[in-house]
Amino acid sequence: FSPLRRISIKILVHSLFSMLIMCTILTNCIFMTMNNPPDWTKNVEYTFTGIYTFESLVKILARGFCVGEFTFLRDPWNWLDFVVIVFAYLTEFVNLGNVSALRTFRVLRALKTISVIPGLKTIVGALIQSVKKLSDVMILTVFCLSVFALIGLQLFMGNLKHKCFRNSLENNETLESIMNTLESEEDFRKYFYYLEGSKDALLCGFSTDSGQCPEGYTCVKIGRNPDYGYTSFDTFSWAFLALFRLMTQDYWENLYQQTLRAAGKTYMIFFVVVIFLGSFYLINLILAVVAMAYEEQNQ
């Protein structure tokens, strides 16, 4: 080993070197949180870049750059360091049009903390391992969601467009003439029944066990879907999103109430099955895989 390499190895394995890098990263993070940084922080920025460059040079001199098994670029954690430095010099010395977009990559410096703190390294390692192991569970989840989305599509397509429509019109008005002129929120509130405080017209259905309209209103299928058109089973993609909502239990009771009001109470069976399979079983299966991966990483 050349003297330069020996010195590099000594620096690299020294605990003070790790401490210096950790303190630099944390200080850098503090500086990044500043709203309107003063001019002198520019020099501090250069110092940080210098320290990161020094760290990488030490690692490259001690381990080699890329030829050989344990060299600098063979460790994925060093890829992050390399990217941080490359972007630091790019934003500083190369005149690129939209620099603010590149400055976003400064945030990657905070991720350097992971490679320095051993505990964090383990957790992130477990996370990456779990993602690899999750592929099978993800395939199963997507498959199950797709099957239920297709069932939802067949059962509830267009149902969430059912609304309670006013039973009194002008002489020249018909359902179709109104459908063609409905645009503003004001128009909707003129012709449809709204519960107090509700942003969507009252849903209804045509089956005996679905929601009925109050006196003076009739159920029709007109206009857009609830929640600005985002809640529906009208296409496979919207149905898939609705099923994902059920699986993650993201305000799912609202979707459940809307659908049951428009389609009928019988369809609660569909929701029971989806919640049990999707929300209770699949979510816990995902958690189990993550837990197993973390356990393996710890061992």
Epitope: M157, G158, N159, H162, F165, N167, S168, L169, T174, L175, E176, S177, M179, F206, E215, G216, T218, C219, V220, K221, I222
Partner: nanobody, 124 residues
Framework: EVQLVESGGGVVQPGGSLRLSCAAS?????????TGWYRQAPGKQRELVAR???????NYADSAKGRFTISRDNAKKTVYLQMNSLRPEDTALYYC?????????????????WGQGTLVTVSS
Amino acid sequence: EVQLVESGGGVVQPGGSLRLSCAASSRQFIRDVFTGWYRQAPGKQRELVARIYNEGNTNYADSAKGRFTISRDNAKKTVYLQMNSLRPEDTALYYCLFSGTISTGREYRSGDYWGQGTLVTVSS
């Protein structure tokens, strides 16, 4: 395609009466907002004569008030227009309009569904 069956048209003398029927008896007709009678005289635009909402409330054109009566038989899914004291200016093709929701088998569809029309001629 959904079809409304209209009947009762014909030739009648001024001052006479006619009863028009409009049957939406097909299972495809689910629920109407209203079912109405419209007429179109030669060279004129189609205009409302009378309509009846599903709850029974009615609307009449000024020319039909006091002479015409619209009624419905929900069991038979039929709407009737009783026309009394007919005048020559009542001569027109009378159309039935189901404004509401139909079932296509796969989904529900709301809109206007017109009949073929029945001709009413008032002349001496």
